[in-house]
Amino acid sequence: HSDGIFTDSYSRYRKQMAVKKYLAAVLGKRYKQRVKNK
């Protein structure tokens, strides 16, 4: 759970999840792009 991230603030936790979601989307797009270019 929480990938070892510890935070006492619920809003900070939500922010971390939002960042994680954004990075997953960006990295996912990059991966799809690389596959497409092959």
Epitope: H1, D3, Y10, S11, K21, A24
Partner: antibody, heavy 117, light 112 residues
């Protein structure tokens, strides 16, 4: 409008486990923070934990750490709360609730779990 | 954990009169994002709780304007300006700023 529908009442023996389900409709389940809160008969409310389904990321209340497991099935928009090593003090109504703006905007109807020998 | 202390435990008010419920937290609920995650819930017998107020003073849509929330830091108040028969319920404050999320003990509001 988000709707949360929970599984039916359960009667369990001390020492056993219970798994309560909560099916969401009318919203983006995967991108929601799904919480579980319980209420013992005639008592107040107690937060148990949450799950963020996209990453299956969980946070549990210290009191329930090691005894509660919250999971989610994105394909059916259903969250589950499993509580193990049940004792009589766990007799309560268990609610799921979805966060909006940092507070619980939508609640399930509640599931009564009775622990009795 | 943050301790949420509600007072009074119960309150009997005449129809049309004002009802005031207090809630005190053991630590400031002002978050780093500038918001105060103090919430008020209403619960009627046999029903799940219902959100009335969030961010200390923002009324949920559809909630009558006789309900208002105020306060900051550690001291908060829920006011029902003119009590109606349908307001008979238990009211809970709870904080969503810090883990573990915690609730007040509840205030039962009855008609005098």
């Amino acid at each position: 409008e988000v709707q949360l529908v929970q599984s039916g009442a359960e009667v369990k023996k001390p020492g056993s486990s219970v798994k309560v389900s909560c099916k969401a409709s009318g919203g983006t389940f995967s991108d929601s923070y799904m919480h579980w809160v319980r209420q013992a008969p005639g008592q107040g409310l107690e937060w148990m934990g949450l799950i963020y389904p996209i990453f299956a990321d969980t946070r549990y209340a210290q009191k329930f750490q090691g005894r509660v497991t919250i999971t989610a099935d994105e394909s059916t928009s259903t969250a589950y709360m499993e509580l193990s090593s049940l004792r009589s003090e766990d007799t309560a109504v268990y609610y799921c609730a979805i966060d909006q703006d940092g507070s619980f905007a939508y609640w399930g109807q509640g599931t009564l779990v009775t622990v009795s020998s | 954990d943050i301790v949420m202390t509600q007072s009074p435990d119960s309150l009997a008010v005449s129809l049309g009169e004002r009802a005031t419920i207090n809630c005190k937290s053991s630590q400031s609920l002002l978050d780093a994002d500038g918001k105060t995650y103090l919430n008020w819930l209403q619960q009627k017998p046999g029903q799940p709780p219902k959100r009335l107020i969030y961010w200390a003073s923002t009324r949920e849509s559809g909630v009558p304007d006789r309900f208002s929330g105020s306060g900051s830091g550690t001291d908060f108040t829920l006011t029902i300006s003119s009590l109606q028969a349908e307001d008979v319920a238990v009211y809970y404050c709870w904080q969503g700023t810090w883990f573990d999320l915690t609730f007040g003990g509840g205030t039962k509001v009855e008609i005098k």
